[in-house]
Amino acid sequence: AFGISGVQKYTRALHDSSITGISPITEYLASLSTYNDQSITFALEDESYEIYVEDLKKDEKKDKVLLSYYESQHPSNESGDGVDGKMLMVTLSPTKDFWLHANNKEHSVELHKCEKPLPDQAFFVLHNMHSNCVSFECKTDPGVFIGVKDNHLALIKVDSSENLCTENILFKLSET
Protein backbone atom coordinates (compact mmCIF):
# COMPACT_ATOMS: atom_id res chain seq x y z
CA ALA A 1 0.00 0.00 0.00
CA PHE A 2 1.05 3.62 -0.41
CA GLY A 3 3.68 4.67 2.08
CA ILE A 4 2.45 8.22 1.68
CA SER A 5 -0.97 9.25 2.92
CA GLY A 6 -2.22 9.81 -0.64
CA VAL A 7 -4.81 7.10 -1.01
CA GLN A 8 -6.34 7.12 2.44
CA LYS A 9 -6.70 10.91 2.34
CA TYR A 10 -8.28 10.55 -1.06
CA THR A 11 -11.66 11.80 0.01
CA ARG A 12 -10.60 15.07 -1.55
CA ALA A 13 -12.83 16.96 -3.94
CA LEU A 14 -13.28 14.67 -6.92
CA HIS A 15 -11.03 15.23 -9.91
CA ASP A 16 -11.87 18.40 -11.73
CA SER A 17 -13.13 16.70 -14.79
CA SER A 18 -13.19 18.13 -18.25
CA ILE A 19 -11.52 15.04 -19.66
CA THR A 20 -11.59 14.93 -23.46
CA GLY A 21 -14.18 17.66 -23.27
CA ILE A 22 -16.70 15.52 -21.39
CA SER A 23 -17.55 15.21 -17.73
CA PRO A 24 -17.86 11.89 -15.96
CA ILE A 25 -21.42 10.82 -15.33
CA THR A 26 -20.35 9.60 -11.90
CA GLU A 27 -17.23 9.12 -9.81
CA TYR A 28 -16.54 7.22 -6.64
CA LEU A 29 -13.80 5.59 -4.60
CA ALA A 30 -13.55 1.82 -4.47
CA SER A 31 -11.02 -0.84 -3.70
CA LEU A 32 -10.11 -3.18 -6.50
CA SER A 33 -9.61 -6.90 -5.98
CA THR A 34 -9.27 -9.92 -8.20
CA TYR A 35 -11.83 -12.65 -8.73
CA ASN A 36 -9.89 -14.64 -6.12
CA ASP A 37 -10.05 -11.79 -3.62
CA GLN A 38 -6.47 -10.63 -3.85
CA SER A 39 -6.08 -6.88 -3.47
CA ILE A 40 -4.67 -4.49 -6.04
CA THR A 41 -2.21 -2.28 -4.21
CA PHE A 42 0.01 0.62 -5.19
CA ALA A 43 3.47 1.41 -3.83
CA LEU A 44 5.85 4.31 -4.34
CA GLU A 45 9.25 2.88 -5.26
CA ASP A 46 12.19 4.87 -6.62
CA GLU A 47 9.97 7.84 -7.41
CA SER A 48 7.54 5.79 -9.48
CA TYR A 49 4.49 3.81 -8.56
CA GLU A 50 4.33 0.03 -8.76
CA ILE A 51 1.13 -1.99 -8.93
CA TYR A 52 0.88 -5.26 -7.02
CA VAL A 53 -1.63 -8.06 -6.71
CA GLU A 54 -1.38 -9.50 -3.23
CA ASP A 55 -3.10 -10.99 -0.22
CA LEU A 56 -3.53 -8.40 2.49
CA LYS A 57 -2.97 -9.12 6.16
CA LYS A 58 -6.13 -9.33 8.24
CA ASP A 59 -6.45 -5.70 9.35
CA GLU A 60 -4.52 -4.09 6.50
CA LYS A 61 -6.44 -1.30 4.80
CA LYS A 62 -7.26 -1.70 1.14
CA ASP A 63 -6.00 0.92 -1.28
CA LYS A 64 -8.74 2.91 -2.95
CA VAL A 65 -9.00 3.97 -6.54
CA LEU A 66 -11.06 6.83 -7.92
CA LEU A 67 -13.20 5.43 -10.72
CA SER A 68 -14.52 8.04 -13.14
CA TYR A 69 -17.20 6.81 -15.53
CA TYR A 70 -17.82 8.31 -18.95
CA GLU A 71 -20.29 7.57 -21.70
CA SER A 72 -18.87 6.85 -25.10
CA GLN A 73 -20.60 6.30 -28.38
CA HIS A 74 -19.34 3.62 -30.67
CA PRO A 75 -20.44 4.31 -34.23
CA SER A 76 -23.21 2.22 -35.69
CA ASN A 77 -20.92 0.89 -38.42
CA GLU A 78 -18.69 -0.61 -35.71
CA SER A 79 -21.43 -2.01 -33.53
CA GLY A 80 -23.53 -3.25 -36.41
CA ASP A 81 -26.52 -1.50 -34.86
CA GLY A 82 -28.96 0.84 -36.49
CA VAL A 83 -28.29 3.13 -33.56
CA ASP A 84 -25.05 4.19 -31.97
CA GLY A 85 -24.26 1.90 -29.05
CA LYS A 86 -23.37 3.51 -25.77
CA MET A 87 -20.45 2.09 -23.86
CA LEU A 88 -19.38 2.85 -20.33
CA MET A 89 -15.75 3.90 -20.09
CA VAL A 90 -13.75 4.28 -16.93
CA THR A 91 -10.50 5.85 -15.79
CA LEU A 92 -8.79 4.60 -12.62
CA SER A 93 -6.74 6.89 -10.42
CA PRO A 94 -5.20 5.62 -7.16
CA THR A 95 -3.69 8.95 -6.23
CA LYS A 96 -3.93 12.53 -7.39
CA ASP A 97 -2.71 13.12 -10.95
CA PHE A 98 -1.83 9.46 -11.56
CA TRP A 99 -3.93 7.15 -13.72
CA LEU A 100 -3.75 3.53 -14.79
CA HIS A 101 -2.44 3.50 -18.29
CA ALA A 102 -2.36 0.76 -20.94
CA ASN A 103 1.05 0.25 -22.48
CA ASN A 104 0.05 -1.83 -25.47
CA LYS A 105 3.62 -2.24 -26.77
CA GLU A 106 4.83 -3.78 -23.51
CA HIS A 107 1.49 -5.47 -22.71
CA SER A 108 1.72 -3.81 -19.33
CA VAL A 109 -0.43 -1.71 -17.02
CA GLU A 110 1.38 1.29 -15.60
CA LEU A 111 0.69 4.30 -13.42
CA HIS A 112 1.39 7.50 -15.31
CA LYS A 113 1.24 11.09 -14.20
CA CYS A 114 -1.05 12.60 -16.81
CA GLU A 115 -2.10 16.04 -17.85
CA LYS A 116 -5.68 16.65 -18.88
CA PRO A 117 -7.12 15.86 -21.27
CA LEU A 118 -6.16 12.28 -20.47
CA PRO A 119 -4.79 10.15 -23.30
CA ASP A 120 -6.88 7.34 -24.74
CA GLN A 121 -4.56 4.85 -23.04
CA ALA A 122 -6.07 5.88 -19.69
CA PHE A 123 -9.59 4.88 -20.73
CA PHE A 124 -11.03 1.40 -20.40
CA VAL A 125 -14.38 0.07 -21.55
CA LEU A 126 -16.19 -1.42 -18.58
CA HIS A 127 -17.86 -4.81 -18.92
CA ASN A 128 -20.06 -6.44 -16.30
CA MET A 129 -19.21 -10.12 -16.06
CA HIS A 130 -20.11 -13.03 -13.87
CA SER A 131 -22.91 -11.09 -12.23
CA ASN A 132 -20.91 -8.94 -9.80
CA CYS A 133 -17.49 -8.83 -11.43
CA VAL A 134 -16.20 -6.33 -13.95
CA SER A 135 -13.50 -6.30 -16.58
CA PHE A 136 -11.62 -3.45 -18.20
CA GLU A 137 -11.01 -3.44 -21.96
CA CYS A 138 -8.44 -1.10 -23.48
CA LYS A 139 -10.04 1.70 -25.42
CA THR A 140 -6.97 1.80 -27.64
CA ASP A 141 -6.85 -1.95 -28.28
CA PRO A 142 -10.25 -3.71 -28.39
CA GLY A 143 -10.05 -7.31 -27.26
CA VAL A 144 -7.22 -6.54 -24.84
CA PHE A 145 -8.11 -6.45 -21.13
CA ILE A 146 -6.45 -5.61 -17.84
CA GLY A 147 -5.63 -8.95 -16.26
CA VAL A 148 -3.50 -10.63 -13.61
CA LYS A 149 -0.20 -12.24 -14.56
CA ASP A 150 2.49 -13.30 -12.06
CA ASN A 151 1.08 -11.15 -9.25
CA HIS A 152 1.08 -8.05 -11.42
CA LEU A 153 -1.42 -6.37 -13.68
CA ALA A 154 -0.82 -6.95 -17.37
CA LEU A 155 -2.65 -6.56 -20.65
CA ILE A 156 -4.20 -9.82 -21.80
CA LYS A 157 -5.57 -10.52 -25.26
CA VAL A 158 -8.95 -12.23 -25.20
CA ASP A 159 -9.63 -14.09 -28.41
CA SER A 160 -13.31 -15.01 -28.15
CA SER A 161 -16.39 -14.06 -26.17
CA GLU A 162 -16.23 -17.42 -24.34
CA ASN A 163 -12.95 -16.31 -22.79
CA LEU A 164 -14.43 -13.05 -21.49
CA CYS A 165 -15.31 -14.79 -18.25
CA THR A 166 -11.83 -16.16 -17.55
CA GLU A 167 -10.94 -15.42 -13.96
CA ASN A 168 -7.70 -13.55 -14.60
CA ILE A 169 -9.50 -10.60 -16.23
CA LEU A 170 -12.30 -10.41 -13.64
CA PHE A 171 -12.21 -7.85 -10.85
CA LYS A 172 -14.42 -6.88 -7.94
CA LEU A 173 -15.16 -3.34 -6.85
CA SER A 174 -15.89 -2.62 -3.21
CA GLU A 175 -16.55 0.62 -1.41
CA THR A 176 -15.54 -0.89 1.94
Partner: antibody, heavy 122, light 107 residues
Framework: EVQLVESGGGLVQPGGSLRLSCAAS????????MSWVRQAPGKGLEWVAS????????YYADSVKGRFTMSRDNSKNTLYLQMNSLRAEDTAVYYC???????????????WGRGTLVTVSS | DIQMTQSPSSVSASVGDRVTITCRAS??????LAWYQQKPGKAPTLLIY???SLQTGVPSRFSGSGSGTDFTLTISSLQPEHFATYYC?????????FGGGTKVEIK
Protein backbone atom coordinates in the same frame (compact mmCIF):
# COMPACT_ATOMS: atom_id res chain seq x y z
CA GLU B 1 -35.15 3.30 -34.11
CA VAL B 2 -34.89 0.54 -31.54
CA GLN B 3 -37.94 -1.72 -31.28
CA LEU B 4 -38.54 -4.75 -29.10
CA VAL B 5 -41.65 -6.80 -29.80
CA GLU B 6 -42.71 -9.63 -27.52
CA SER B 7 -45.01 -12.47 -28.55
CA GLY B 8 -46.03 -15.92 -27.38
CA GLY B 9 -48.14 -15.07 -24.35
CA GLY B 10 -51.54 -16.56 -23.70
CA LEU B 11 -53.65 -18.67 -21.39
CA VAL B 12 -52.06 -21.86 -20.11
CA GLN B 13 -52.97 -24.39 -17.44
CA PRO B 14 -50.84 -24.86 -14.32
CA GLY B 15 -47.94 -27.17 -15.13
CA GLY B 16 -48.03 -26.13 -18.79
CA SER B 17 -45.40 -24.48 -20.96
CA LEU B 18 -45.05 -21.39 -23.14
CA ARG B 19 -42.24 -19.89 -25.16
CA LEU B 20 -42.02 -16.12 -25.31
CA SER B 21 -40.11 -14.34 -28.07
CA CYS B 22 -38.69 -10.85 -28.24
CA ALA B 23 -37.81 -9.72 -31.76
CA ALA B 24 -35.41 -6.78 -31.92
CA SER B 25 -34.89 -4.26 -34.67
CA UNK B 26 -32.59 -1.24 -34.76
CA UNK B 27 -29.97 -2.97 -32.60
CA UNK B 28 -27.80 -6.05 -32.65
CA UNK B 29 -29.06 -8.06 -29.68
CA UNK B 30 -25.75 -9.82 -29.12
CA UNK B 31 -24.07 -6.47 -28.34
CA UNK B 32 -26.26 -5.80 -25.32
CA UNK B 33 -27.35 -7.33 -22.08
CA MET B 34 -31.01 -8.27 -22.31
CA SER B 35 -33.48 -9.09 -19.58
CA TRP B 36 -36.99 -10.34 -19.01
CA VAL B 37 -38.97 -8.38 -16.43
CA ARG B 38 -42.52 -9.24 -15.40
CA GLN B 39 -45.39 -7.44 -13.77
CA ALA B 40 -48.25 -9.28 -12.11
CA PRO B 41 -51.67 -7.59 -12.46
CA GLY B 42 -51.77 -4.49 -10.26
CA LYS B 43 -48.27 -5.16 -8.89
CA GLY B 44 -44.75 -3.83 -9.34
CA LEU B 45 -41.87 -4.83 -11.57
CA GLU B 46 -39.96 -8.06 -10.96
CA TRP B 47 -36.75 -9.10 -12.67
CA VAL B 48 -36.93 -12.61 -14.15
CA ALA B 49 -33.78 -13.38 -16.15
CA SER B 50 -30.80 -11.80 -17.92
CA UNK B 51 -28.08 -12.50 -20.42
CA UNK B 52 -25.11 -10.12 -20.34
CA UNK B 53 -23.84 -8.32 -23.40
CA UNK B 54 -20.38 -9.59 -22.52
CA UNK B 55 -21.60 -13.17 -22.80
CA UNK B 56 -22.23 -14.06 -19.15
CA UNK B 57 -25.36 -15.85 -18.06
CA UNK B 58 -28.16 -16.52 -18.41
CA TYR B 59 -29.05 -15.73 -14.81
CA TYR B 60 -32.46 -16.32 -13.22
CA ALA B 61 -34.55 -15.11 -10.32
CA ASP B 62 -34.90 -17.77 -7.62
CA SER B 63 -38.64 -17.87 -8.26
CA VAL B 64 -38.15 -19.21 -11.80
CA LYS B 65 -34.82 -21.06 -11.55
CA GLY B 66 -35.05 -24.57 -12.96
CA ARG B 67 -38.34 -23.83 -14.73
CA PHE B 68 -37.50 -20.98 -17.12
CA THR B 69 -34.75 -20.92 -19.75
CA MET B 70 -33.58 -17.75 -21.46
CA SER B 71 -31.74 -17.86 -24.77
CA ARG B 72 -31.06 -15.75 -27.81
CA ASP B 73 -30.70 -16.49 -31.49
CA ASN B 74 -28.24 -13.96 -32.86
CA SER B 75 -29.01 -14.90 -36.47
CA LYS B 76 -32.67 -14.00 -35.93
CA ASN B 77 -31.90 -11.11 -33.56
CA THR B 78 -34.46 -12.63 -31.19
CA LEU B 79 -34.57 -13.33 -27.48
CA TYR B 80 -36.54 -16.22 -25.99
CA LEU B 81 -37.96 -17.26 -22.65
CA GLN B 82 -38.99 -20.90 -22.41
CA MET B 83 -41.35 -21.24 -19.45
CA ASN B 84 -42.09 -24.73 -18.09
CA SER B 85 -44.01 -25.99 -15.05
CA LEU B 86 -46.00 -22.77 -14.99
CA ARG B 87 -47.77 -21.74 -11.79
CA ALA B 88 -50.61 -19.35 -11.05
CA GLU B 89 -48.09 -16.92 -9.54
CA ASP B 90 -46.33 -16.65 -12.93
CA THR B 91 -49.37 -14.78 -14.28
CA ALA B 92 -48.03 -11.43 -15.44
CA VAL B 93 -47.18 -9.20 -18.35
CA TYR B 94 -43.68 -10.18 -19.49
CA TYR B 95 -41.42 -7.46 -20.90
CA CYS B 96 -38.08 -7.80 -22.59
CA UNK B 97 -35.72 -4.93 -21.84
CA UNK B 98 -32.36 -3.80 -23.19
CA UNK B 99 -29.40 -2.58 -21.15
CA UNK B 100 -28.56 1.06 -21.78
CA UNK B 101 -24.89 0.26 -22.20
CA UNK B 102 -23.24 -2.26 -24.45
CA UNK B 103 -21.43 -4.58 -22.05
CA UNK B 104 -22.69 -3.10 -18.79
CA UNK B 105 -25.91 -3.22 -16.77
CA UNK B 106 -25.05 -0.13 -14.68
CA UNK B 107 -27.26 2.19 -16.75
CA UNK B 108 -30.57 0.38 -16.27
CA UNK B 109 -32.90 -0.52 -19.15
CA UNK B 110 -33.39 2.10 -21.86
CA UNK B 111 -35.74 0.21 -24.19
CA TRP B 112 -38.66 -2.04 -23.28
CA GLY B 113 -41.05 -4.01 -25.40
CA ARG B 114 -44.81 -3.49 -25.01
CA GLY B 115 -45.12 -6.76 -23.12
CA THR B 116 -47.02 -9.99 -23.59
CA LEU B 117 -49.58 -11.29 -21.10
CA VAL B 118 -49.16 -14.77 -19.66
CA THR B 119 -52.15 -16.11 -17.74
CA VAL B 120 -51.76 -19.35 -15.80
CA SER B 121 -55.17 -20.67 -14.76
CA SER B 122 -57.21 -23.84 -14.82
CA ASP C 1 -30.26 -9.27 -3.05
CA ILE C 2 -30.50 -5.54 -2.48
CA GLN C 3 -33.91 -4.34 -1.30
CA MET C 4 -35.24 -1.06 -2.66
CA THR C 5 -37.81 0.82 -0.60
CA GLN C 6 -39.79 3.61 -2.22
CA SER C 7 -41.84 6.23 -0.45
CA PRO C 8 -44.51 7.33 -0.48
CA SER C 9 -46.43 4.49 -2.14
CA SER C 10 -48.85 7.09 -3.52
CA VAL C 11 -49.08 10.85 -3.64
CA SER C 12 -51.94 13.15 -4.63
CA ALA C 13 -50.85 16.35 -6.31
CA SER C 14 -52.10 19.11 -8.56
CA VAL C 15 -50.78 20.37 -11.88
CA GLY C 16 -47.86 22.70 -11.20
CA ASP C 17 -46.93 21.07 -7.90
CA ARG C 18 -43.42 19.99 -7.04
CA VAL C 19 -43.35 16.25 -6.31
CA THR C 20 -40.54 14.37 -4.60
CA ILE C 21 -40.23 10.59 -4.46
CA THR C 22 -37.55 8.86 -2.42
CA CYS C 23 -35.86 5.51 -2.81
CA ARG C 24 -33.68 3.79 -0.23
CA ALA C 25 -31.37 0.86 -0.88
CA SER C 26 -30.67 -1.76 1.78
CA UNK C 27 -26.94 -1.32 1.08
CA UNK C 28 -24.78 1.15 -0.81
CA UNK C 29 -25.25 1.17 -4.59
CA UNK C 30 -22.87 4.07 -5.38
CA UNK C 31 -24.72 6.07 -8.09
CA UNK C 32 -26.11 3.22 -10.15
CA LEU C 33 -29.79 3.93 -9.78
CA ALA C 34 -32.42 4.30 -12.49
CA TRP C 35 -35.91 5.84 -12.39
CA TYR C 36 -38.79 4.76 -14.64
CA GLN C 37 -42.23 6.13 -15.43
CA GLN C 38 -45.06 3.74 -16.23
CA LYS C 39 -48.52 4.65 -17.43
CA PRO C 40 -51.43 2.19 -17.22
CA GLY C 41 -51.24 -0.53 -19.87
CA LYS C 42 -47.84 0.68 -21.09
CA ALA C 43 -44.25 -0.43 -20.64
CA PRO C 44 -41.95 1.47 -18.30
CA THR C 45 -39.79 4.21 -19.80
CA LEU C 46 -36.37 5.23 -18.51
CA LEU C 47 -36.26 8.75 -17.06
CA ILE C 48 -33.01 8.94 -15.11
CA TYR C 49 -29.91 6.74 -15.02
CA UNK C 50 -26.77 6.92 -12.87
CA UNK C 51 -28.89 8.64 -10.18
CA UNK C 52 -28.93 12.05 -11.86
CA SER C 53 -28.40 11.73 -15.62
CA LEU C 54 -31.43 12.58 -17.73
CA GLN C 55 -32.28 10.07 -20.43
CA THR C 56 -32.43 11.58 -23.93
CA GLY C 57 -35.84 13.08 -24.68
CA VAL C 58 -36.94 13.33 -21.04
CA PRO C 59 -38.04 16.85 -20.03
CA SER C 60 -35.81 18.75 -17.63
CA ARG C 61 -38.72 18.99 -15.16
CA PHE C 62 -37.46 15.59 -14.00
CA SER C 63 -34.31 15.46 -11.93
CA GLY C 64 -32.61 12.85 -9.79
CA SER C 65 -30.15 13.08 -6.95
CA GLY C 66 -28.47 10.98 -4.31
CA SER C 67 -25.75 8.40 -3.89
CA GLY C 68 -24.99 5.49 -1.62
CA THR C 69 -28.33 4.43 -0.16
CA ASP C 70 -30.65 7.44 -0.45
CA PHE C 71 -32.02 8.78 -3.73
CA THR C 72 -34.65 11.26 -4.83
CA LEU C 73 -36.68 11.82 -7.98
CA THR C 74 -38.13 15.31 -8.28
CA ILE C 75 -40.75 16.58 -10.72
CA SER C 76 -40.36 20.35 -10.48
CA SER C 77 -43.73 21.27 -11.96
CA LEU C 78 -46.22 18.46 -12.41
CA GLN C 79 -47.92 18.31 -15.81
CA PRO C 80 -51.04 16.31 -16.75
CA GLU C 81 -48.93 13.73 -18.62
CA HIS C 82 -46.87 13.07 -15.48
CA PHE C 83 -49.66 11.29 -13.62
CA ALA C 84 -48.25 7.76 -13.61
CA THR C 85 -46.43 5.24 -11.44
CA TYR C 86 -42.71 5.72 -10.85
CA TYR C 87 -40.21 2.98 -10.04
CA CYS C 88 -36.60 3.09 -8.92
CA UNK C 89 -34.18 0.29 -9.80
CA UNK C 90 -30.71 -0.38 -8.48
CA UNK C 91 -28.24 -1.31 -11.21
CA UNK C 92 -25.11 -1.57 -9.07
CA UNK C 93 -25.30 -5.22 -8.12
CA UNK C 94 -26.78 -8.24 -9.76
CA UNK C 95 -29.64 -9.11 -9.74
CA UNK C 96 -31.37 -5.82 -10.58
CA UNK C 97 -34.08 -4.97 -8.07
CA PHE C 98 -36.96 -2.51 -8.22
CA GLY C 99 -38.71 -0.37 -5.66
CA GLY C 100 -42.39 -1.05 -5.02
CA GLY C 101 -43.51 1.98 -7.03
CA THR C 102 -45.03 5.38 -6.28
CA LYS C 103 -48.35 6.26 -7.87
CA VAL C 104 -48.73 9.97 -8.61
CA GLU C 105 -52.46 10.74 -8.69
CA ILE C 106 -54.50 13.85 -9.44
CA LYS C 107 -55.67 15.65 -6.33
Amino acid sequence: EVQLVESGGGLVQPGGSLRLSCAASGITLSSYGMSWVRQAPGKGLEWVASIFGSGGGPYYADSVKGRFTMSRDNSKNTLYLQMNSLRAEDTAVYYCAKDRYSGSYYGGFDYWGRGTLVTVSS
Amino acid sequence: DIQMTQSPSSVSASVGDRVTITCRASQGITSWLAWYQQKPGKAPTLLIYAASSLQTGVPSRFSGSGSGTDFTLTISSLQPEHFATYYCQQANSFPPTFGGGTKVEIK
